[in-house]
């Protein structure tokens, strides 16, 4: 195992559940702050949406369209002009992402707002199967601050099946968050944004390396879960959060003991939302199968605070608000493995709309 650089210097949790689960439920209502930025047009087509930060930049005329480099923000992830030909991108300038990668202007992008009443109950969506996610302390794993997120690189052997013949292996996990007073999940539910979100990125076993799978339908699959505040500390997450100070600087990488990755996800893997979208950062490659769990993972207020204040990004800016605005569905249907719609009848709706990875 490689030895890590700290700043270049150098078990189950919460009782009966890994997550201290909480159902999203149909009673989740958007707060005024998190309400959708525009009502849907009459034709049912989803509006283009932008971060409030982007909207502010537009109204103040701050965007410099001559370069993919965006103006500096307190939360932004920006690149210094070091070396030639950088593909700069930042969360403060998401409107410029298509200049970095044209796919970011694609029609089937992520994240999305999950409108419960518009989800289609799909009986064929079975509980996910995770194999080999309970890692031992050795070998150690690389934990890094890449300037955009905190990333845990996962070893070979973590296998996941979306369904028969749809097998994947986990590559890495990372988080998205806000600030102490602003939530930072990427996906939203009925317009409600959660404090943070975990993504576990998987590669289809049909491909040997990630670059082969980019843009291929079903080539990548991401498991996503919302992080929510609760009174108790989450001991599984503490195994990550306790190391954040060691990787506070952009580019820092350390080795930490292996942990139970499944304990970072909700305990109920049977209730989830499913849709086809994209990577949520450039190059925004499409064909990614998203699974967003209905059950949330519970962290203490202190843990969520630690996540939001511990890391630094480019140009000595805090690494915060690292989420992309929700993207239009453009006709996509979000499927649910359970009856999530408020007006769901005993009979499943849109049963035949179910897709399989790679279709």
């Amino acid at each position: 195992q490689p030895q890590g650089l700290s700043g270049m210097q150098g078990e189950p949790s919460l009782g009966d559940s890994s997550s201290g689960e909480d159902e999203l439920g149909v009673d989740v209502l958007p707060s005024e702050e998190d309400a959708p930025e525009e009502a849907d047009p009459p034709d049912g087509e989803d509006p283009p949406e932008v971060n409030s930060e982007d909207r502010m930049e537009e109204s103040l005329g701050l965007e410099d369209l001559s370069t993919p480099e965006a103006p500096e923000h307190s939360q932004g992830s920006h690149g210094d002009e070091k070396g030639g030909g950088h593909s700069h991108w930042s969360y403060g300038g998401t409107l410029l992402w298509p200049q970095v990668s044209p796919a970011c202007a694609g029609r089937f992008q992520s994240p999305v707002d999950i409108r419960l009443e518009r989800t289609a109950f799909c009986r064929t969506l079975q509980p996910l199967e995770l194999l080999g996610y309970e890692l031992q302390p050795l070998p150690e794993l690389s934990l890094s601050n890449n300037g955009h997120t905190v990333q845990l690189t996962l070893p070979p052997g973590l296998k996941m099946a979306l369904g028969p013949g749809q097998e994947y292996r986990a590559l890495q996990l990372h988080l998205h968050w806000g600030t102490s007073d602003h939530p930072g999940s990427e996906h939203t539910v009925n317009g409600h944004r959660f404090p943070a979100e975990i993504h576990v990125v998987h590669l289809s076993t049909a491909f040997s390396e990630l670059h082969e799978a980019l843009g291929r339908p079903g080539g990548l699959a991401v498991l996503a879960a919302f992080l929510q505040e609760s009174p108790e500390e989450n001991s599984a997450y503490e195994q990550l959060l306790s190391h954040l100070e060691e990787i506070s600087e952009e580019g820092s990488k350390i080795e930490i003991p292996g942990l139970d990755v499944s304990a970072l996800l909700p305990s109920d893997l049977s209730r989830y939302y499913r849709y086809e979208g994209s990577l949520t950062t450039p190059p925004c490659s499409q064909g990614v199968i998203w699974t967003v769990f209905n059950e949330t993972v519970k962290l203490s207020a202190k843990q969520l605070h630690t996540l939001s204040v511990s890391l630094w990004g480019p140009r000595d800016s805090r690494l915060q608000l690292n989420f992309r605005a929700t993207q239009p569905l453009n006709g996509r249907t979000i499927e649910a493995s359970f009856p999530a719609a408020e007006d769901s009848s005993p009979e499943p709706v849109h049963v035949n709309s179910c897709f399989t990875a790679g279709d």
């Epitope: 992830s77 920006h78 690149g79 210094d80 002009e81 070091k82 070396g83 030909g85 950088h86 593909s87 700069h88 890094s144 890449n146 300037g147 955009h148 990333q151 690189t153 590559l171 890495q172 990125v201 590669l203 390396e209 990630l210 670059h211 082969e212 980019l214 600087e249 952009e250 580019g251 950062t281 450039p282 190059p283 990004g313 480019p314």
Partner: nanobody, 117 residues
Framework: QVQLQESGGGLVQPGGSLRLSCAAS???????????MAWYRQAPGKQRELVAV???????QYSSSVKGRFTISRDNAKKTVLLQMNSLKPEDTAVYYC????????WGQGTQVTVSS
Amino acid sequence: QVQLQESGGGLVQPGGSLRLSCAASGGARNIFSFAAMAWYRQAPGKQRELVAVITSAGGTQYSSSVKGRFTISRDNAKKTVLLQMNSLKPEDTAVYYCNADYYQDYWGQGTQVTVSS
């Protein structure tokens, strides 16, 4: 197929300099600009050690043992990452590996650096 190819290694006297280069080929070229690039090294009988990192935004970090002597840089247009090594010491002798970290690790085959009088 080879995705990352290192070059520039060789034999150098203590106090001398070398410049290592890593070029991305094949599909690795497509993800190069978005990857954190790093140089690792492995001396005989020792664990592989992280030497320097440059993020996609250009932020750099160095191990304490090389800070002030080594400089990492990248050229996304040419899909290359460089490691300028000055004031070399015998303890810098190792095989140097290029690494691209973008959702998964990509590795080069390594290039030998020997510092000896």
